[in-house]
């Protein structure tokens, strides 16, 4: 079976890393486990990993935004940032605003690697399933 | 044969969903049909679907922009929005502006699904083949 | 072996096309050669090609930004722009700013094709490995 995941935004996320909807809607989860916000790799190999986050706010104050996909493995002491997007000075002060960040690339992942998504400002994330998501597939 | 498509912007299009160049240039279409703006799936399975739209204008008024990839199937009464990007308050009033929206993710598609791209304002789309495109491939 | 590459930003790039880190960090290079900024295809076929560039500056002057993935082959006299992103009027004058451009799509590539990334303003690119990268894999 193809190892694949597509998880969508979960609006009751209250902490980092982001948590994801892994059951309902346009979700996919096959040959990969989901655990506390993370996708857990169970077979070493090459994977295309992607994420999109939709940020929006009622009144722009240009708070710096970041969106990271990072990896954690018990063998390593520190998280490894695989992909990252940052935004600064992106909207007109006081206006309602909206913007997305998209990341996607190929990585060599090892069994037991845990992949997560982090954002700098949770209150500015909109969790609609079509707008904010996290996925991967084994090549 | 690998099921794959890469369609590029078609500039004399006035209709929604967007219409695409399916013959000339850097276009690919193999094992998937193109019909009236849509990519028609003929084999159930996992697909990576992507689209990029290039918006630009002579004088910024921050018209809200949206870019959607959606799916239609005669078995379902309503379109399903698979991926979406929105932009608000993204340029300086009165200035010439340009911005792209990129979407890409994995979906489980069924034979006879039709995939389309929609934008909120067609007049602001630039259809250069390198800038605006729509594609997929079967994993 | 799977033909795959993921190259990351190299901060001593001084000219176009961009040069890339092909040895250290989260780099992948298998079944594809790297030569003077370019990924060299050695087997004809379908490839998913992607790139992300992270632009940032101390004081916004809205210099137009472009990010291109292009192809060169000795059989053709001219470069072919495969994908391109442009940004104009994207930040507030005088402010510190940051923005990313992401490109990714499927192409039919031929043995001896050379793929490169070009940007309009090298001094505004940040080369962190998680932020600026270039990759592909054979479907």
């Amino acid at each position: 079976l193809r190892k694949v995941a597509h998880l969508t935004g979960k609006s009751n996320s209250r902490s980092m890393p982001l948590e994801w909807e892994d059951t309902y809607g346009i979700v996919l989860l096959s040959g990969v486990k989901y655990k506390k916000g993370g996708l857990v790799i169970n077979e070493t190999g090459l994977y295309f990993v992607y994420s999109k986050v939709y940020f929006r706010g009622q009144s722009c104050n240009n708070l710096p935004l970041s969106h990271k996909v990072y990896m954690r493995n018990s063998k390593y002491p520190q998280d490894l940032v695989m992909m990252e997007g940052k935004m600064m000075s992106y909207c007109t002060t006081g206006q309602m605003w909206a913007r997305s960040s998209y990341l996607g690339a190929v990585f060599n992942l090892t069994s037991a690697d845990h992949l997560y998504v982090n954002v700098s400002e949770l209150s500015l994330v909109n969790f609609e399933e079509s707008q904010t998501f996290f996925g991967l597939y084994k090549l | 044969l690998r099921k794959v498509a890469h369609l590029t912007g078609k500039s004399n299009s006035r209709s929604m969903p967007l219409e695409w160049e399916d013959t000339y240039g850097i276009v690919l279409l193999s094992g998937v049909k193109y019909k009236k703006g849509g990519l028609v799936i003929n084999e159930t399975g996992l697909y990576f679907v992507y689209s990029k739209v290039y918006f630009r204008g002579q004088s910024c008024n921050n018209l809200p922009l949206s870019h959607k990839v959606y799916m239609r199937n005669s078995k379902y009464p309503q379109d399903l929005v698979m991926m979406e990007g929105k932009m608000m308050s993204y340029c300086t009033t009165g200035q010439m502006w340009a911005r792209s929206s990129y979407l890409g993710a994995v979906f489980n598609l069924t034979s006879a699904d039709h995939l389309y791209v929609n934008v909120s304002e067609l007049s602001l789309v630039n259809f250069e083949e390198s800038q605006t495109f729509f594609g997929l491939y079967k994993l | 072996l799977r033909k795959v590459a993921h190259l990351t930003g190299k901060s001593n790039s001084r000219s176009m096309p961009l040069e890339w880190e092909d040895t250290y960090g989260i780099v992948l290079l298998s079944g594809v050669k790297y030569k003077k900024g370019g990924l060299v295809i050695n087997e004809t076929g379908l490839y998913f090609v992607y790139s992300k560039v992270y632009f940032r500056g101390q004081s916004c002057n809205n210099l137009p930004l472009s990010h291109k993935v292009y192809m060169r082959n000795s059989k053709y006299p001219q470069d072919l722009v495969m994908m391109e992103g442009k940004m104009m009027s994207y930040c507030t004058t005088g402010q510190m700013w940051a923005r990313s451009s992401y490109l990714g799509a499927v192409f039919n590539l031929t043995s001896a094709d050379h793929l490169y990334v070009n940007v309009s303003e090298l001094s505004l690119v940040n080369f962190e490995e998680s932020q600026t990268f270039f990759g592909l894999y054979k479907l």
């Epitope: - | 500039s11 004399n12 006035r14 002579q58 008024n61 018209l63 809200p64 949206s66 934008v119 007049s123 | -």
Partner: antibody, heavy 119, light 111 residues
Framework: QVQLVQSGAEVKKPGSSVKVSCKAS????????ISWVRQAPGQGLEWMGW????????QYNENFKGRVTLTTDKSTSTAYMELSSLRSEDTAVYFC????????????WGQGTLVTVSS | EIVMTQSPATLSVSPGERATLSCRAS??????????IHWYQQKPGQAPRLLIY???HLESGIPARFSGSGSGTEFTLTISSLQSEDFAVYYC?????????FGQGTKVEIK
Amino acid sequence: QVQLVQSGAEVKKPGSSVKVSCKASGYTFTRFDISWVRQAPGQGLEWMGWIFPGDGSSQYNENFKGRVTLTTDKSTSTAYMELSSLRSEDTAVYFCARSLISTAMFDHWGQGTLVTVSS
Amino acid sequence: EIVMTQSPATLSVSPGERATLSCRASKSVSTSDFSYIHWYQQKPGQAPRLLIYLASHLESGIPARFSGSGSGTEFTLTISSLQSEDFAVYYCQHSRELPRTFGQGTKVEIK
């Protein structure tokens, strides 16, 4: 900057036709609709139809179907509105307006052309 | 066709005061994304000028004292503090379907 410049005032006999021109500049003519709106003396605004210069497609208000014809000349970035079988109630100022395709708001207007229908 | 009804027909306001103009559509002009209603200002002998688009978005170059709100069938144009140059006729227009139709207009005059 975007400009729409219309042809001058016309006086026409009942039963005849009138053709008003609208020359566009300052933007890509083939990417936006041109709509035509008329305003009878002391009255409100009435939308007549739109044309898309990109492919020449058009749509008309049923109230004018069969009497109005919208055309464009891409080489000169000019739109035309021809109204036939004129009657006295067609006396009005006729405006062309640039219209965004999807949002269909009229963001730039011509100065207007007064058409008087009188015997 | 969608009928647009504006009220009042005439609004008498003193300079510096707030003006509130209403526009009602005979059926909803909103989708999940946008409300397809636009507001224009017209002065005697001039073409209309776009003020507000998609119910609440200020057109570039229009002063911030103009604002729009509403969804579905009920919409409002507000001028927070009337200036002398704001005395004019105001029209709402929908673009939800064909034909595009305008309201009959509200004349804002000096009290």
